[in-house]
Interface confidence: low
């Protein structure tokens, strides 16, 4: 579990020419908030999807009035951050949408009127507890400003907020094979293990022994994808096998959501999937045109020449959704394994394989030493995926291939001084002292500490390591 | 080590035919993309063609295509690039390399005479 | 087709110095951009994917930037290993497509 935060920065005019009208007028003032929308990023979803992650609402900014004939300033903001918690594991991947919304606060029958000023949108790589990330997103003659992170909600820790941290039992030291939690020095890791067989991909523990599923999977493991089409009847009995989610009483019931948008229910509320031409919580807001640059990253907006008609936008190649906001982003679908770096060619997807991994998707993991050779006489050490070289001496860097200075590691001991040599190096030393790094010290009766003296070796003389 | 090895250039007359071949060591050359770039004397880099790693998929530069054909042998470790109907401005030294997209590993080339 | 070019062609530079190379794209490519080194009589040499990640090995004083259509190569002092031709390289499209290289010589 955590939260996901966002902060606002600025909204304003964008940079070039035809900066936009000033959203508010003398006669009509009005105050700015916003709406964030998240998803997870792991799967090609409709744009119109509900915000499975979680949405939330600023409060109102301040109210605004024009000034005649002043450009269009960055206008003031809401205080605070918006928040979105998350129940769930963190999915490091996500798209997010955010709206910058004007409430006119001029003699309106029925209250203030909202309307939809700005929409921009996009698809984020984020670890939790990592720090502020900047972004800067246009949406036609507007600029949004802002910065996001996500942090985990204790006792969760890491970049996906599934590791439990606990405080210590005992001062000193964690429990055998536990580790401190890093920034929680003085807590443990819990040892977290899923039931067994708990799908890594769909499932994960926040307790050891249980198996808890992320939106769409289910089944004791987590491995049986939902469908709602294989129910008998809409009320009728779970089965875990075909996977039939049965909802109970819901947010939806009714259809809260006006103007024919569907409405689908979020592990916390209630999305609205609005026609073209309709914005809002509920769709209850109308009016968005072509003059309004409702087609992001390159859409060509066609029709909507009035409030009552609709708009089409199309996208360019690599976006889709109604207004061409979503990345098409095929690697969202992490399908390079063991770490593997995915490339979307247009034509296939490529997997670039983590050293010791190899395969299409990287799925093969390699003998660590294979093919690999250690130049001057070092030997190949298998570990983690990757290889390494324990040099001879004299020799260095990850193949064994760099001339080491022997006396770099100050070997002599005992104040012993150090000699680079062709076969290695020599040790001189200090009077009291013998052995090859000097290491024995010589007892004062003239004995060493060695068991035998090697014949015809003097206390003091070099000695050569080879 | 990954290795690249090319072999098969060397001078034709144009409208004649050769065959690279390029022999991989050092990696699991079934499980790579592999590509063909190419550079003629004193110019720059031009990518020729490449092929998936069942040899499923092939890709072309347009002054190529319909004359030069790219295959492979995963059981072999080998790649191949017949060339026919030669021209005088395919006279370079051709390269094979292992495909990202990017290639990070190269060959020392085979050079490829078209002359009359 | 994207057209990729790179500026300078040729540069004169010290050792010692900071060096920057510049690759433009006819439009936007996002991120996928390498970047390769070749000595003369030699193959190129793999030193940057995805615009900025270091390949593993390549000294660290080499490092890539940009995104969309304007990218830069950039050698933080240049030492004489570095005199070479330096080619970009967009990849994410169905015919790989190299900028002309720029040559950087000894002053």
């Known amino acids: 579990a955590g939260v996901f935060e966002l902060q606002i920065h600025s909204f304003g005019p964008g940079p070039g020419p035809g900066a936009p009208r000033s959203p508010c007028s003398a006669r009509l003032p009005c105050r700015l908030f916003f709406r964030v929308c998240l998803k997870p990023g792991l799967s090609e979803e409709a744009a119109e999807s509900p915000c499975a992650l979680g949405a939330a609402l600023s409060a109102r900014g301040p109210v605004y009035t024009e000034q005649p004939g002043a450009p269009a300033p960055d206008l003031p903001l809401p205080d605070g951050l918006l928040q979105v918690p998350f129940r769930d594991a963190w999915p490091g991947t996500f798209s997010f949408i955010i709206e910058t919304w004007r409430e006119e606060l001029g003699d309106q029958i029925g209250g203030p009127a909202w309307s939809l000023l700005a929409r921009v949108a996009g698809r984020r790589r984020l670890a939790a507890g990592g720090p502020w990330a900047r972004d800067i997103q246009r949406a036609g003659a507007w600029e949004l400003r802002f910065s996001y992170r996500a942090r985990c909600e204790p006792p969760a820790v890491g970049t996906a907020c599934t590791r439990l941290c606990r405080p210590r039992s005992a001062p000193s030291r964690c429990g055998p094979g536990l580790r401190p939690c890093a920034p929680l020095e003085d807590e443990c890791e819990a040892p977290l293990v899923c039931r067994a067989g708990c799908s890594p991909e769909h499932g994960f523990c926040e307790q050891p022994g249980e198996c808890r599923c992320l939106e769409g999977w289910t089944g004791p493991l987590c491995t049986v994808p939902v469908s709602t089409s294989s129910c008998l009847s809409p009320r009728g009995p779970s089965s875990a096998t075909t996977g039939c989610l049965v909802p109970g009483p819901g947010p939806c019931d009714g259809n809260p959501c006006a103007n024919g948008g569907s409405c689908s229910e979020t592990p916390r509320s209630f999305e609205c999937t609005c026609p073209r031409g309709f914005y809002g919580l509920r769709c209850e807001v109308s009016g968005v045109t072509c003059a309004d640059g409702p087609c992001f990253n390159g859409g060509l907006c066609v029709g909507g020449a009035d409030p009552d008609s609709a708009y089409i936008c199309h996208c360019p190649p690599g976006f889709q959704g109604s207004n061409c906001e979503k990345r098409v982003d095929r690697c969202s679908l992490q399908p390079c394994r063991n770490g593997g770096l995915c490339l979307d060619l247009g034509h296939a997807l490529r997997c670039r394989c983590r050293a010791g991994f190899a395969g299409p998707r990287c799925e093969h993991d390699l003998d660590d030493c294979a093919g690999r050779a250690c130049a001057n006489g070092g030997t190949c050490v298998e570990g983690g995926g990757a290889h390494r070289c324990s040099c001879a001496l004299g020799f260095g860097g990850r193949d064994c291939r760099e001339r080491a200075d022997p006396c770099a590691a100050r070997p002599c001991a005992h104040g012993g001084r150090c000699y680079a040599h062709f076969s290695g190096l020599v040790c001189a030393c200090a009077p009291g002292y013998m052995g090859a790094r000097c290491e024995f010290p010589v007892h004062p009766d003239g004995a060493s500490a060695l068991p035998a003296a090697p014949p015809g070796l003097r206390p003091g003389d070099p000695q050569r390591y080879l | 080590e990954v290795h690249l090895v090319e072999s098969g250039g060397g001078l034709v007359q144009p409208g004649g035919s050769l065959r690279l071949s390029c022999a991989a060591s050092?990696?699991?050359?079934?499980?790579?993309?592999m590509t063909w770039v190419r550079q003629a004397p004193g110019k720059g880099l031009e990518w020729v063609a490449n092929?998936?790693?069942?040899?499923?998929?092939?890709y072309y530069v347009d002054s190529v295509k319909g004359r030069f054909t790219i295959s492979r042998d995963n059981a072999k470790n080998s790649l191949y690039l017949q060339m026919n109907s030669l021209r005088a401005e395919d006279t370079a030294l051709y390269y094979c390399?292992?495909?990202?997209?990017?290639?990070?590993?190269w060959g020392q080339g085979t050079l490829v005479t078209v002359s009359s | 087709d994207i057209q990729m070019t790179q500026s300078p062609s040729t540069l004169s530079a010290s050792v010692g110095d900071r060096v920057t190379i510049t690759c433009r794209a006819s439009?936007?490519?996002?991120?996928?951009l390498a970047w390769y080194q070749q000595k003369p009589g030699k193959a190129p040499k793999f030193l940057i994917y995805?615009?900025?990640s270091l390949e593993s090995g390549v000294p660290s004083r080499f490092s890539g930037s940009g995104s969309g259509t304007e990218f830069t190569l950039t050698i933080s002092s240049l030492q004489p290993a570095d005199f070479a031709t330096y080619y970009c390289?967009?990849?994410?499209?169905?015919?790989?497509?190299f900028g002309q290289g720029t040559k950087v010589e000894i002053k």
């Open positions: 092929i998936k790693e069942d040899g499923s998929e092939k």
């Open positions: 439009q936007s490519v996002s991120d996928w």
């Open positions: 390399a292992r495909d990202w997209g990017y290639f990070d590993y």
């Open positions: 390289q967009l990849y994410n499209s169905y015919s790989p497509t």
């Open positions: 050092g990696f699991t050359f079934s499980s790579y993309w």
């Open positions: 995805r615009a900025s």
